[in-house]
């Protein structure tokens, strides 16, 4: 949940209590367990970023 007194995060981002700022939902592809990803429900689940095959 966003901290009291904080401006709402822009579209495509979500509040991170861990980092104390809005974070891009796009980064949940690489770091899906980040706290703010819970607020990115509109973003479809995605696997970890690919490495070399």
């Amino acid at each position: 949940e966003q901290a009291p007194g904080q401006a709402p995060c822009s579209r495509g981002s979500s509040w991170s209590a861990d980092l104390d700022k809005c974070m891009d939902c796009a980064s949940c592809r690489a770091r899906p367990h980040s706290d703010f990803c819970l607020g990115c429900a509109a973003a479809p689940p995605a696997p970890f970023r690919l490495l070399w095959p």
Partner: antibody, heavy 119, light 111 residues
Amino acid sequence: EVKLGESGGGLVQPGGSMKLSCVASGFPFTKYWMNWVRQSPEKGLEWVAEIRLKSDNYATHYAESAKGRFTISRDDSRSSVYLQMNNLRAEDTAIYYCSPTYADTMDYWGQGTSVTVSS
Amino acid sequence: DIVLTQSPASLAVSLGQRATISCKASQSVSTSTYSYMQWYQQRPGQSPKLLIKYASKLDSGVPARFSGSGSGTDFTLNIHPVEEEDTATYYCQHSWELPYTFGGGTRLEIK
């Protein structure tokens, strides 16, 4: 204010070794992956190595050109990241930057440290 | 590895006009939702600086004169109106997979 200070560069002979250091401040270091990126006139900007978090068992990833020769490490207690470079070649001559990334973006860059490999 | 090809290699634009820089990837760097492409600015004698992330989102503090667009393999950086301080080299970078790669850069000169 985010600050990144690279050091350790200089002149080294081919086949030699060098250890670069980067001290960071102004952001939660333990929550960010850290990268080394280098820049040369010949190859432009080139990602070299990345180290992830303690919770990732400090997983490391390397460019093909760095595999087997370079080792990235970090000391969270000192908010520092290092690049040990062995068996250096002329083509490793570049400015080396450290840069934190949460996931995809290299959010900040230091001033860089210059490495010259020449006999 | 994903190859990023920037064009043009250099361009000169009159003060107040539009600068357009292209970056083409050798394979798609987009999902149905997001594109994993960034743009950086490097002024002469300085370190690179993040301008645009995820193809179109301005980093904090970046003037609205800068905009990014594109998806899949084709991406564009626009600067309008250009100012003297925009003299720099601009690089695209993908974060689709490892290794991260950068474009060769586009040098922008203001006439």
